[in-house]
Interface confidence: low
Amino acid sequence: ALDAAYCFRNVQDNCCLRPLYIDFKRDLGWKWIHEPKGYNANFCAGACPYLWSSDTQHSRVLSLYNTINPEASASPCCVSQDLEPLTILYYIGKTPKIEQLSNMIVKSCKCS
Amino acid sequence: ALDAAYCFRNVQDNCCLRPLYIDFKRDLGWKWIHEPKGYNANFCAGACPYLWSSDTQHSRVLSLYNTINPEASASPCCVSQDLEPLTILYYIGKTPKIEQLSNMIVKSCKCS
């Protein structure tokens, strides 16, 4: 799996999970989240050569097409596969609210 | 929806469905498929600015992050959303076989 266990331990040009820390205030301009101040969102990036973690038959076809026609603009892209929620604390007036934001943390990637 | 009805009628730099005809023999090196000789596979490509057909909360966060940090390499990617199968005819010896290959045709796209 193209997850932290594999990707963070290897130097990998191909599609893999990349570390990314997002500070809510600085990076998103969000001032409404009280806790946490930021989080490890991660992201997916890298090349998608033939059969590298292809998601669908179409992405396999596209990567094979790209191998034979490497200069063509049609190629699969490295995107998130498994995502996890993030629990946040914010305030409405003086009332604290705890909420779970779905699909906030990328855990693994795929070529799609 | 970022489908043919919208994308093929508009000049769109942002994430959209793009036409792509694949010839099995020439483009993939596949000689085993008898019919069709090729098909309209299509593909997805284009930029993913903030809120442009974002797939998940993470892709929305990432596109907002990319707006504020445009030099960063972390940004959502334009990938396939809806896919359809393709029916093919091939031979095993002299015996014709009809099979449906799943997820071969891209019908719409998303930023993920």
């Epitope: 040009d13 191909n14 990036a45 890298g46 090349a47 998608c48 050569p49 191998t67 026609n69 490497p70 200069e71 063509a72 603009s73 190629s75 | 769109q12 730099d13 942002n14 994430c15 793009r18 020439r26 490509a45 284009g46 930029a47 993913c48 030099e71 390499s73 940004s75 990617c77 334009c78």
Partner: antibody
Framework: EQQLVESGGGLVQPGGSLRLSCAVS????????VNWVRQAPGKGLEWIGY???????YYASWANGRFTISKDSAKNSVYLQMNSLRAEDTAVYFC???????????????????WGPGTLVTVSS | DAVLTQSPDSLAVSLGERATINCQSS????????LSWFQQKPGQPPKLLIY???TLTSGVPDRFSGSGSGTDFTLTISSLQAEDVAVYYC????????????FGGGTKVEIK
Amino acid sequence: EQQLVESGGGLVQPGGSLRLSCAVSGFSLSSYTVNWVRQAPGKGLEWIGYISYGGSAYYASWANGRFTISKDSAKNSVYLQMNSLRAEDTAVYFCARHMQVGGAPTGSMAAFDPWGPGTLVTVSS
Amino acid sequence: DAVLTQSPDSLAVSLGERATINCQSSQSVYNNNYLSWFQQKPGQPPKLLIYGASTLTSGVPDRFSGSGSGTDFTLTISSLQAEDVAVYYCAGGYSGSSDKYAFGGGTKVEIK
């Protein structure tokens, strides 16, 4: 700012070898294809070859065998190794990236942008 | 392998007049429109003006335009300015050819 800068040019004797470097900044070699193009003094442009974002190298038919393109993504550099050099290889050598249009690599469009300033290679005894 | 032939080799045009450069390919360029035009001034690298046969690169004045499809292409400067004095090259992209790209021989544009 996205930039490419060539280095390693100079005077070399016929039959000799030379390795040119193309240092890139502002973008990742994991995401872009980089080409080598040359221009003999007072002549036109001639495509040598490229190395794709995935690491595959492709060459013009005349360059195959004598010229080798490689890259080191960690060092943000692309290289052109030239062997068995001849007087007719005297030229300014440019590296140029495939541009991107709306996030999609343009590839076959031959849309090369940006370019490096070039480095002069002189093959003479 | 593909050969791109530009005509004329040189062109002298009065300021404010129209300049037209032709580019003919010995075989169809990929997708019928994978042709670019470059401008080169002495001591400088080439500058991309037009890609996809007719799409103007960002920042290029709209007096430049490109047209054509398949094997025959044209670059037009509608009203020549002093800063347009340069050598102009066409470049084509090809699929299934051992040479993926080819440049035309160049056309020198001067003021009459």
